[in-house]
Interface confidence: low
């Protein structure tokens, strides 16, 4: 009786089980009673990542620099190209089909975590004793200047956006 199901890495065609093509190869012709499945390797810039019966290999993904993408891992005959974002950008989705600019942290906020290819900049408010006076995707909050260590006194208090202003101590005559 003809089989109704085939083993792993086989497929059912014309009431018989044929071997699937291995990853990196495409199907040229199905097996027959007398011949094995015929497979051919994928061409350059093509891939198939599973045991398959595909007659065409898939094109490697193109990491479009106009979308801010670059190659993170070059594709092989068995794997697709993996794209990531250029420096200063991060992916808009897990598939990384396009990128957006990393967020800058505004004055009064510092960078808690620098952006990566997949996550945006994480900003944090500068706590008391710290400040940031720039909009930056790199800069952390800076500590206020310690006037005392310079033998000076605070003339103007610092804020989350400005450093303290130090000045000379009043001398008793």
């Amino acid at each position: 009786e003809p089989p109704t199901a085939c083993r792993e890495k086989q497929y059912l065609i014309n009431s018989q089980c044929c071997s699937l093509c291995q990853p990196g190869q495409k199907l040229v012709s199905d097996c027959t009673e007398f011949t094995e499945t015929e497979c051919l390797p994928c061409g350059e810039s093509e891939f198939l990542d599973t045991w398959n019966r595909e007659t065409h290999c898939h094109q490697h993904k193109y990491c479009d620099p106009n979308l801010g993408l670059r190659v993170q891992q070059k594709g092989t005959s068995e794997t697709d190209t993996i794209c990531t974002c250029e420096e200063g950008w991060h992916c808009t989705s897990e598939a990384c089909e396009s990128c957006v600019l990393h967020r800058s942290c505004s004055p009064g906020f510092g960078v808690k975590q620098i952006a990566t290819g997949v996550s945006d900049t994480i900003c944090e408010p500068c706590p008391v004793g710290f400040f940031s006076n720039v909009s930056s995707a790199f800069e952390k909050c800076h500590p206020w200047t310690s006037c005392e260590t310079k033998d000076l006194v605070v003339q103007q208090a610092g804020t989350n956006k400005t450093d303290v202003v130090c000045g000379p101590q009043d001398r008793l005559r």
């Epitope: 979308l67 250029e86 420096e87 200063g88 957006v100 600019l101 620098i114 930056s136 790199f138």
Partner: antibody
């Protein structure tokens, strides 16, 4: 190929304003920050600021803040730099320059626009 | 602001000889991501600057391999291994790690 084409030379009176344009082609305009750099006659280069054309976010050199306004028109792939309250020391060549992504450097430059401020 | 100081201000070198231009930064240009945000540009009279070297050592597209960048932290060098007539220009270093981005004052390179 990437091209940045700037508007022509301008002669302006002190106290007036000027708006210089920079038309981009050969790449996705919204994908790259546009920078502006000033070069006074016989002098070096000064970075004025930049704009992200996608969001319209700007970063200014403090020296040019209040003096300079950067804008971008996504529909025409054109960046603009407006200088107000012109003085004779604003006489300079103004360049637009694209910020390369992975490079984080100014990879392509416009041909420059000479702005002359004279009464 | 970060100050970039180039030396010398001008330089005359014979054709085929090595030319070296230095750039010193008032603070480190090395980011925590290990990149050094120091770049070099060439400007010929009446033309816009052209990017030569980005992020310390990387040659931009189409730049001849006689141009190379080196250095670390705060001290950087642009080297032209064998000077050609077309290399006569003003050369600028630039940093893009801290806003405002700044340029060196320029070094004028001439043929001896």
């Amino acid at each position: 190929q990437v091209q940045l084409v700037q508007s022509g030379a301008e002669v302006k009176k002190p106290g007036s304003s000027v708006k210089v344009s920079c038309k981009a082609s050969g790449y996705t305009f919204t994908g790259y920050n546009m920078n502006w750099v000033r070069q006074a006659p016989g002098q070096g280069l000064e970075w004025m600021g930049n704009i992200d054309p996608y969001y319209g976010n700007t970063n200014y050199n403090q020296k040019f803040k209040g003096k300079t306004t950067l804008t971008a028109d996504k529909s025409t792939s054109t960046a603009y730099m407006e200088l107000s309250s012109l003085r004779s020391d604003d006489t300079a060549v103004y360049y637009c320059a694209r910020l390369g992504l992975q490079l984080y450097a100014l990879d392509y430059w416009g041909q420059g626009t000479l702005v002359t401020v004279s009464s | 602001d970060i100050v970039l100081t180039q030396s010398p201000d001008s330089l005359a070198v014979s054709l085929g000889e090595r030319a070296t231009i230095n750039c010193r930064a008032s603070q480190s240009l090395v980011h925590s991501n290990a990149n050094t945000y120091l770049h070099w540009y060439q400007q010929k009279p009446g033309q816009p600057p052209k990017l030569l070297i980005y992020k310390l050592t990387n040659r931009f597209f189409g730049v001849p391999d006689r141009f190379s960048g080196s250095g670390s932290g705060t001290d950087f060098t642009l080297t032209i291994s064998s000077l050609q007539a077309e290399d006569v220009a003003v050369y600028y270093c630039q940093q893009s790690i801290h806003v405002p981005w700044t340029f060196g004052q320029g070094t004028k390179l001439e043929i001896k």
